[in-house]
Amino acid sequence: TLNSVLNSNAIKNLPPPLGGAAGHPGSAVSAAPGILYPGGNKYQTIDNYQPYPCAEDEECGTDEYCASPTRGGDAGVQICLACRKRRKRCMRHAMCCPGNYCKNGICVSSDQNHFRGEIEETITESFGNDHSTLDGYSRRTTLSSKMYHTKGQEGSVCLRSSDCASGLCCARHFWSKICKPVLKEGQVCTKHRRKGSHGLEIFQRCYCGEGLSCRIQKDHHQASNSSRLHTCQRH
């Protein structure tokens, strides 16, 4: 069963600092044996990965979406699955890898002016409407007056980073912008290859915190340009 996979791949002897206790996320490094991990149409072995149960796409990482690992998807446990690359089949945008979106059941590049226009247009519309959605978590939930009172906290709607509390920045999440945590050391960051490319991001990340810069991760230097992982590192 899926659960035997979940349990047999539990991380052994996890030291406390990695654990994200006291409300802080831990290290981005996972130390589990290689397991079968669905990606595209084939199962591939990914080292150092543990299945991650989820209820929503937004709980998963940027390169993942939330779904049942079995075809047909029963009502059992869902896990974060590897995002679908270009030209792979999809049912919703979140299934496609960053830089792509789901069109007519296929992941296609979002590096097209008309799609970028659609995103910008929708964001503009959402801020001119009292019933705009809060973020990816509440696309199906309208804003209540209570949410406006928590303005500036994580998850609050914003227009610019100055609308957010200390330690947060204003970043895109689906079709609106919300306050998200400024990135800490070791967290994955986005390095924009060309000016203006951030306009294509549906899940925008904050910038790196003070004293940190977004640089290529040392052990990823050998990777191809497109798959290089950038993390927030000390200057």
């Epitope: 991380i11 996890l14 990695l18 654990g19 994200g20 409300g23 802080h24 996320p25 831990g26 290290s27 981005a28 996972s30 990965y49 543990q50 991650y52 989820c54 209820a55 929503e56 937004e58 709980e59 998963c60 990482g61 940027t62 390169d63 993942e64 974060c80 809060l134 973020d135 990816g136 978590y137 509440s138 939930t141 949410m147 928590t150 906290q153 994580e154 998850g155 609050s156 999440h173 998200k180 945590p181 990135l183 967290q187 994955v188 899940f203 990340r205 904050c206 992982l229």
Partner: nanobody, 124 residues
Framework: EVQLVESGGGLVQPGGSLRLSCAAS????????LKWVRQAPGKGLEWVSH????????MYADSVKGRFTISRDNAKNMLYLQMNSLKPEDTAVYFC?????????????????RGQGTQVTVSS
């Protein structure tokens, strides 16, 4: 700052019950799915149960299915875990947790926001 504070743990005999609570603050509670994870002595983190934003969907690990019930009260910013028919193998530190979400490329249990945990010991 995200804060999660668990309570309700303790020593209980096999077959007994406990109800864990988790008080959350520092984030808009009702828009996040939440979960319980546990860590037995000398073992890694193990996912226990999950609940959707509105509480309408729940998921459980096979090892606790039919014995544990997860619930939430969005008005009070509280998450709960009702544990019945407890077994010695349920002995662990229990954490309530929230995903770190889209700030990582791949999600993992150790990336989650979670509290300090509450100890549950099942022994006769």
């Amino acid at each position: 700052e995200v804060q999660l504070v668990e309570s309700g743990g303790g020593l209980v005999q096999p077959g007994g019950s406990l109800r864990l609570s988790c008080a959350a603050s520092g984030f808009p509670f009702s828009i996040y799915p939440l979960k319980w994870v546990r860590q037995a002595p000398g073992k890694g983190l193990e996912w226990v149960s999950h609940i959707s934003r509105d509480g309408g969907r729940t998921m459980y690990a096979d090892s606790v299915k039919g014995r544990f019930t997860i619930s939430r009260d969005n008005a009070k910013n509280m998450l709960y875990l009702q544990m019945n028919s407890l077994k010695p193998e349920d002995t662990a530190v229990y954490f309530c947790a929230r995903s770190a979400g889209k700030v990582v490329s791949r999600a993992s249990l150790e990336n989650d926001y979670r509290g300090q945990g509450t100890q549950v010991t099942v022994s006769s």
